[in-house]
Structures are given as C-alpha cells and as structure tokens.
Interface confidence: low
C-alpha cells in the first residue's frame, strides 16, 4: 500500500496523487553512460522546465531504492547500498566500487509539488577495466589537446578582464564557497536521528522553485511532499511506498 | 524468511487503551511502508492506519483518526498501533502488512497472523 | 473516501470452470503515471490474506498464472482460468490510490 494515498510506496516513498492540470517539466539526466570496473560515476538528473517545488528525491536501481534526498531530513543511503554510495553532488548520486552487476537501468524520481512525480531514466554499463582502458587511449591526445587550447585562451581573457577591472575598486564577493559548501549531515537519517534541514541540496545550477530564492545554500525550503499533498497523512495510499 | 508477527491484543474495556506491536524480520525493515489492517468477526478487511519507510508520511482510516498512532522503530524493526479510547467496534483481527517494493506500488505482499483485540465491557 | 464495490459476493463455481470477479470503484483509480491502483487480495479460509495482483494487472510473485487482473479507470476484473479447490477463500479488491485505502466487501469463492 505504498500508501493509500499512494500514500505510505518509496520508497518511501514510495507518491502523493498529481494536481490537476499540466505536467509541464522535464528530466534532463546523463542518459546512457558507461564506466570502468572499480571506479566511480556521478549519476545525475535536472528537473526543468517547472516552477513545481521539489520536495524529494529517490534514487532507485530497478525496483531497488539506492537513495533517498528529502528536503527537510537530508539524505538516506538505503542500508543495502551504503557502502557502495555517496549522496551528491547536488541531487546527484555517486555510485563506487563498481561492479559488472551494477549495469542496468537507475532511476531519479522526483516528487514535486503541485505537479506530483517525474522520473528520469539512465542506463550504466559497467565495463571490464581492459575494455575502458581501450577507449580512453584514443580520448586521452584529445582530451590534452583541448585542455592546452583552454589554458591558453582563458589565460587571455583573464588577462585581458583583469586590465579591464583594474581600475575599478569593487570587490566582488565569490558565491563559489556558498555553492559548493558542503552542509553537515551527509549521511542516512532516521526518524530518531535526523541530519540537518536540506543537507542533500546545494544549488549548484538548481531549477527555479527547487531553492526558494536560490540563496545559494541548501534547500531547506523544499516542503515534505507527502505532507504538503497530505501524502504523509495524505494522499495516495501507495504514497506509504511510491507509485509507479 | 520474511516475517511479521504481531501482538499486544486482548480484551479491553471500551475507553481503554492499547498498544499493538509488530516484529519483522528477514527483510530490511527500514526500507519499506508499513500497514495495519484489520478485520472484524465474520467481515471484511479494513485498513486501519500505515506509515512510510521514514515515519514521515502517515495515513489513518477516518473510523480511527484522533484515535489512533502509528508508529516504528526501524532500530527495532518494529511497527507499533497505539489505540486510545477504544470502541466496541474496533474489535477486530489486526494484521502487520509490510508493501512489496520501495520504487514502485507492488501491493502488500506480506501479512502477520494478526493479534486479536476484543472491546467489551 | 473511495468506495470500493464487488459483485457477485458468493460465487459457486464447479473445478475446471473458469470464474470471474467484478470490482468497481466510485472514482478513477487510474494515476496519471499510467498505473491502476487496484489490488487483488486472496483469504483462504482460516488464513491471513495474500496478494494476488497489483496495479490492476500484475500478478504477485508465485501466483499461479490461471489468475489474472484486467480493467482501468473504475471497472476492474479478476478472472480465473480454471478454478482449482485450493482457489476456495474470499477474495477482495483493495484501491491504493488515495488514504484512506479501502477494500471491497468481498467476494467467497465456493466450490459446487
């Protein structure tokens, strides 16, 4: 009964029945994306196209939960994964230690409000070291090529910036310690122990609606969706779960 | 072997209070809704209240609400129905139901054996 | 609240024959996932209840492939190929869709 409201589900959600009208965003993720045995990848979705607010966040590997960002309680690594994964970046998920078993289909599923949930598809393929090793010979005199022909022309136009501002005394204050810190309480949460207020979101390139203001710190302003959608006291009953 | 077993039923008089527990194991319990439901002498199923993987989303049927507190302790793998002001017609079989999945909507897939909780005078 | 209607409630039915059950809801149990929010559940007698189907049409792990669910919207079925004496039990149709879930009354499966 993922909860009647589609309610209790969800993992966990498991989703609260959708508003009426339009469901208007989109998901935007890496698609299909391969990786080496033993490393590490970043599996990433962006919510756009949306003023919806985006209240959680699960991560699922087939009809697993891997993960879930909760606006208020912050992150939840399901204890079947948490050795293996690591909350972020961003709404993010960084999956290590891969394995060949690891291929498959992963799932962001966002639970928004009003609009209710959209999910986003990516397939990984995990493979054997010699066969990744393979393909980054030929990346690698490109990669350093491009990389080379960047140095060059950002230096120039650093260079040529700098005489630019030189006469002018502003400061300008760096958002970029704002964006990138990283808030405390990166880890799974409880009921009986809960991480601080929007300790998975830092708005790093966030849709509009999913941080308020956009303050540039985390998203404590996402709003429980089941309790918005009274999906924690609520929706759809298999919400206690998630919906499909 | 996934496992729900219940207990805390009995007799109480009308008014009284009860506590109902559920002990779950071979599953992770932590990752998954949970439910109460119950069933009267003789009739049919009735769901009672459920609560999320998290206890953040709750829900209650309208018969049981302001009555009635679902709760979990996952450090427990428990479930729990805390009954307050008890009626004659919440007598009733309860049963621990535990949802089948934690992506999607995949039923209830397992059920307890149920606790009996009788409410006379 | 959504209320959830079977018929018939008894339902005698001879081994071999197939059977069908017929729940009906008084709102659309269809999400706008695509997904219908309707279960089938099984009590045999003397037994806890057991999951037959979910989302309208999905048959629950090691349920028999005699048992099937179909319909969308409102009107739902669960038909039984060839009924067995083990299939005797009350069966009933749940909707997940929106707290408080509810079950229908329930339809008991008899052998003739």
């Known amino acids: 009964m993922r909860w009647c409201l589609l309610l209790i589900w969800a993992q966990g959600l498991r989703q609260a029945p959708l508003a009426s009208g339009m469901m208007t965003g989109t998901i935007e993720t890496t698609g299909n994306i391969s990786a080496e045995k033993g490393g590490s990848i970043i599996l990433q979705c962006h919510l756009s196209s949306t003023t919806a607010q985006v209240t959680q966040v699960n991560w699922e590997q087939q009809d697993q939960l891997l993960a879930i960002c909760n606006a208020d309680l912050g992150w939840h690594i399901s204890p079947s994964f948490k050795d293996r994964v690591a909350p972020g970046p961003g709404l993010g998920l960084t999956l290590q230690s891969l394995t060949v078993n690891d291929t498959g289909e992963y799932f962001c599923i966002y639970h928004t409000y009003p609009d209710g949930t959209y999910t986003g598809r990516i397939f990984l393929e995990v493979l054997e070291s010699s066969v990744a090793e393979h393909g980054a010979r030929f990346q690698i005199p490109l990669l350093g090529a491009m990389a080379a022909t960047l140095v060059v022309i950002c230096t120039a136009v650093i260079v040529v910036v700098a005489l630019t501002r030189k006469k002018k005394a502003l400061r300008i204050h760096s958002v970029e310690g704002d964006l990138r810190r990283k808030s405390a309480g990166q880890e799974e949460w409880s009921p009986s122990a809960p991480s601080p207020p929007g300790s998975c979101v830092q708005a790093e390139a966030a849709p509009a609606g999913l941080c308020g203001e956009q303050r540039g710190e985390d998203c404590a302003e996402l709003h429980d969706y089941f309790n918005v959608l009274s999906y924690r006291s609520l929706g759809n009953c298999s919400f206690f779960t998630e919906t499909g | 072997e996934v496992q729900l077993v219940e207990s805390g039923g009995g007799l109480v008089q009308p008014g009284r209070s009860l506590r109902l527990s559920c002990a779950a194991s071979?599953?992770?319990?932590?990752?998954?809704?949970m439910h109460w439901v119950r069933q009267a002498p003789g009739k049919g199923l009735e769901w009672v209240s459920g609560?999320?993987?998290?206890?953040?989303?709750?829900g209650y049927a309208d018969s049981v609400k302001g009555r009635f507190t679902i709760s979990r302790d996952n450090a427990k793998n428990s479930l729990y129905l805390q009954m307050n002001s008890l009626r004659a017609e919440d007598t009733a079989l309860y049963y621990c139901?535990?949802?089948?999945?934690?992506?999607?909507?995949?039923?209830?897939?397992?059920w307890g054996q149920g606790t009996t909780v009788t409410v006379s005078s | 609240d959504i209320v959830m209607t079977q018929s018939p409630l008894s339902l005698p039915v001879t081994p071999g024959e197939p059977a069908s059950i017929s729940c009906r809801s008084s709102?659309?149990?269809?999400?706008?996932?695509?997904?219908?929010?309707l279960d089938w559940y099984l009590q045999k007698p003397g037994q806890s209840p057991q999951l037959l189907i979910y989302?309208?049409?999905n048959r629950a792990s090691g349920v028999p492939d005699r048992f099937s669910g179909s319909g969308s919207g409102t009107d739902f079925t669960l038909k039984i190929s060839r009924v067995e004496a083990e299939d005797v039990g009350v069966y009933y149709c749940?909707?997940?869709?929106?707290?408080?879930?509810?079950f229908g009354q329930g339809t008991k499966l008899e052998i003739k």
């Open positions: 139901t535990k949802d089948g999945g934690n992506r999607r909507y995949y039923g209830v897939d397992v």
């Open positions: 071979g599953f992770t319990f932590d990752d998954y809704a």
């Open positions: 609560i999320s993987w998290n206890s953040i989303t709750i």
């Open positions: 709102q659309s149990l269809l999400h706008s996932n695509g997904y219908n929010y």
């Open positions: 989302l309208g049409s």
């Open positions: 749940m909707q997940a869709l929106q707290t408080p879930c509810s």
